[in-house]
C-alpha cells in the first residue's frame, strides 16, 4: 500500500454550494496509485462518525464536493490505494461555507462525449480514533 497520504490537499469553494478538492500523489518512492478515496463531512456529521465518500481513479486528482450548506464547516481527508491496499489518510483540511448569494440552478448542458469514470457516494463510518 502507499506509504504516505496524498499531499497538497486543497479545498476551494467555487460555487455557492460546491467546492473543488484537489491533491497530489503521495511523496516517496514511485507508487502507482490505482484509486483515491475522498472523505468529507460537516462538523456535525464528523462528530457522528459519518462521512460521505467519493472514489476517483488514480489518474484523477480533483473532485467536486456538492450540495454544501452555507453556515457549515466541512472536513476533508484523502487516501491513496494501490493493488496492495489503502494507504494512510491525509491530515484533515477544513472549509467554511459562508452564506452568499442564493445558489442558481446549474444543470450541466447535455454532452454526449463525457468520459466514463464511475463515482460512488455513500457514508463512511469511522471510529473516533480515525477521525484525528
Amino acid at each position: 500500500a502507499p506509504a504516505g497520504p496524498p499531499v497538497g490537499v486543497k479545498v476551494t469553494l467555487i460555487e455557492d454550494d460546491t467546492a473543488l478538492v484537489s491533491w497530489k500523489p503521495p511523496d516517496g518512492p514511485e507508487t502507482v496509485v490505482t484509486r483515491y478515496t475522498i472523505l468529507y463531512a460537516s462538523r456535525k456529521a464528523w462528530i457522528a462518525g459519518e462521512w460521505q465518500v467519493l472514489h476517483r481513479e488514480g489518474a484523477i486528482t480533483m473532485a467536486l464536493l456538492e450540495n454544501l450548506v452555507a453556515g457549515n464547516v466541512y472536513i476533508v481527508k484523502i487516501s491513496a490505494s494501490n493493488e496492495v491496499g489503502e494507504g494512510p489518510f491525509s491530515n484533515s483540511v477544513e472549509l467554511a461555507v459562508l452564506p452568499k448569494e442564493t445558489s442558481e440552478s446549474n444543470q450541466r448542458p447535455k454532452r454526449l462525449d463525457s468520459a466514463d469514470a464511475k463515482v460512488y457516494s455513500g457514508y463512511y463510518h469511522l471510529d473516533q480514533k480515525s477521525m484525528t
Epitope: D16, K100, E104, N106, R108, S114
Partner: nanobody, 122 residues
C-alpha cells in the same frame, strides 16, 4: 450543439494585461455558472475563477485574486476574464467551462474547444 469558443490569448510581458473571451452557444447561457480553468505546460488542470448565471456571485483562486476579474454579458452569451499584473506562472492554456456533475465525469470540468494560450514572457 453545445459549444464554447475561447479567444484573446497571446504573448504578453510580465506586468501586462490581457482580456480573454468565451462565446457560448447551444444552451441557455444565462442559466449556468461559468468557470475559467487553466493548464500550464506539463501540469494538471487548475481552477481559476467562477461566476454565477446572473453575474452576482464570483469566486477566485488565491493565486489570481486581486489581479483577475471575471465577468459576463448574457446578452452576448459571452464570458470574460480580465487579467492584469500578469506573471510568468500565469502562462497556460485557458478554458471556459461548466461543472460536470453526476456519475459519468472524468474531470470536474468539461472544457470545450481548444482553449486560448496565454504566454507571459519578457
Amino acid at each position: 450543439e453545445v459549444q464554447l469558443v475561447e479567444s484573446g490569448g497571446g504573448l504578453v510581458q510580465p506586468g501586462g494585461s490581457l482580456r480573454l473571451s468565451c462565446k457560448g452557444s447551444g444552451f441557455t447561457f444565462s442559466n449556468y455558472w461559468m468557470h475559467w480553468v487553466r493548464q500550464a505546460p506539463g501540469k494538471g488542470l487548475e481552477w481559476v475563477s467562477a461566476i454565477s448565471g446572473s453575474g452576482g456571485s464570483t469566486y477566485y483562486a488565491d493565486s489570481v485574486k486581486g489581479r483577475f476579474t471575471i465577468s459576463r454579458d448574457n446578452s452576448k452569451n459571452t464570458l470574460y476574464l480580465q487579467m492584469n499584473s500578469l506573471r510568468a506562472e500565469d502562462t497556460a492554456t485557458y478554458y471556459c467551462a461548466t461543472l460536470c456533475r453526476g456519475d459519468s465525469c472524468y474531470s470536474p470540468f468539461d472544457p470545450w474547444g481548444q482553449g486560448t494560450l496565454v504566454t507571459v514572457s519578457s
